[in-house]
């Protein structure tokens, strides 16, 4: 399946409609800043094989359709932005699975690689965390919006494995 | 390999305009906001004001607000810091220094050289 | 604004020493302090940042602390490359700010 140019192609399309969803400047919400700890280490010191890639990847983009498919960040976000960037996530993550089961067979069940996945929904689970904490400011989601762009452009080794023959 | 190339030193005479610029290159010009920061002669370091590169947003020091434009050009990767008509107090180093934005990372880890200006008649 | 207040303005001392400066803040700035080295001619160099994490590259010997309002600088055996000018700053808020700086002279 040629997932690298397609996902690049939706990543980069998904960035630019997470760019353009700001309401308010940032630079009123300096003291919001949080750290939110996405592991780059563990993945940057981690060779991942095209199944494990993809896997992670889906769960990232899975977990960010979730955090953007909320009440709370209905009430955030400028609507038709924010449809048309859970349109491209949606999208994402059926390439994804389509990948999938291109790469591994029906039959088969990818290597579910759990450490990443759980350092993932961790990662997640902190973000949601502090949206809880800071009562859904208007400065929390701009906090968390550019996180989520910084961890979308993060994720080079993955993308990496996605290029890779298993 | 991450750089911050600002433009050469510049005389001027008092009442001249000017530009600076300060060119991005080796990562993502858009994804880090850009400040500039003044050091007058044998003097210490001020923050003059800062700009998101992304949508040319910018937040200026109450000390600079009216004196100084900060802009950008995000398909050249540049920053620009211009005066309408300098003073002899503007005489100074400036230095710009890319800075994370909203994300938890180091603050102005990378800084370009450095532009002097004189203004004198 | 923030007022960012070092101490000591300069001081002396010899290699091997242990040196520290302090930074005090007019407010609440929580840990978000960083550190600069600055040499004469040059570019600031960014040491310390969040109050505590060490810059990549930077020598170990090097260590930040502090939060809310009192942080402190340590070289805890200065080197010759050492001796130069140290910047904290405020990121906590706009305006950014920074202290007046501490010279680090060979006594």
């Known amino acids: 399946c040629d997932l690298p140019q397609t996902h690049s192609l939706r990543n980069r399309r998904a960035l630019i409609l997470l760019a353009q969803m700001g309401r308010i400047s940032p630079f009123s919400c300096l003291k919001d800043r949080h750290e939110f700890r996405f592991p780059e280490e563990e993945f940057d010191g981690h060779q991942f094989q095209k199944t494990q890639a993809i896997s992670v990847l889906h769960e990232m983009i899975q977990q960010t359709f979730n955090l953007f498919s909320t009440e709370d960040s209905s009430a955030a976000w400028e609507q038709s932005l924010l449809e048309k960037f859970s349109t491209e996530l949606y999208q994402q993550l059926n390439d994804l699975e389509a990948c999938v089961i291109q790469e591994v067979g029906v039959e088969e069940t990818p290597l579910m690689n759990e450490d990443f996945i759980l350092a993932v929904r961790k990662y997640f689970q902190r973000i949601t965390l502090y949206l809880m904490e800071k009562k859904y400011s208007p400065c929390a989601w701009e906090v968390v919006r550019a996180e989520i762009m910084r961890s979308f452009s993060f994720s080079t080794n993955l993308k990496k494995g996605l290029r890779r023959k298993d | 390999e991450v750089q911050l190339v600002q433009s050469g030193a510049e005389v001027k005479k008092p009442g001249e305009s000017l530009k600076i610029s300060c060119k991005g290159s080796?990562?993502?010009?858009?994804?880090?906001?850009i400040g500039w920061v003044r050091q007058m002669p044998g003097k210490g370091l001020e923050w003059m004001g800062i700009?998101?590169?992304?949508?040319?947003?910018?937040a200026y020091s109450p000390s600079f607000q009216g004196q100084v434009t900060i802009s950008a050009d995000k398909s050249i990767s540049t920053a620009y810091l211009q005066w309408s008509s300098l003073k002899a107090s503007d005489t100074a180093m400036y230095y710009c220094?890319?800075?994370?934005?909203?994300?938890?990372?180091?603050?102005?880890?990378?800084w370009g050289q450095g532009t002097l200006v004189t203004v004198s008649s | 604004d923030i007022q960012m207040t070092q101490s000591p303005s300069s001081l002396s001392a010899s290699v091997g020493d242990r040196v520290t400066i302090t930074c005090r803040a007019s407010q609440s700035i929580d840990r978000a302090l960083n550190w600069y080295q600055q040499k004469p001619g040059k570019a600031p160099k960014l040491l310390i940042y969040?109050?505590?994490s060490l810059q990549s590259g930077v020598p170990s010997r090097f260590s930040g602390s502090g939060s809310g309002t009192d942080f402190t600088l340590t070289i805890s055996s200065l080197q010759p490359e050492d001796f130069a000018t140290y910047y904290c700053q405020q990121s906590f808020d706009f305006p950014l700010t920074f202290g007046q700086g501490t010279k680090v002279e060979i006594k």
């Open positions: 969040f109050a505590s």
């Open positions: 700009i998101d590169p992304s949508d040319s947003d910018t």
């Open positions: 080796g990562y993502s010009f858009t994804s880090y906001w």
């Open positions: 220094a890319r800075h994370p934005g909203l994300n938890w990372a180091p603050d102005f880890d990378y």
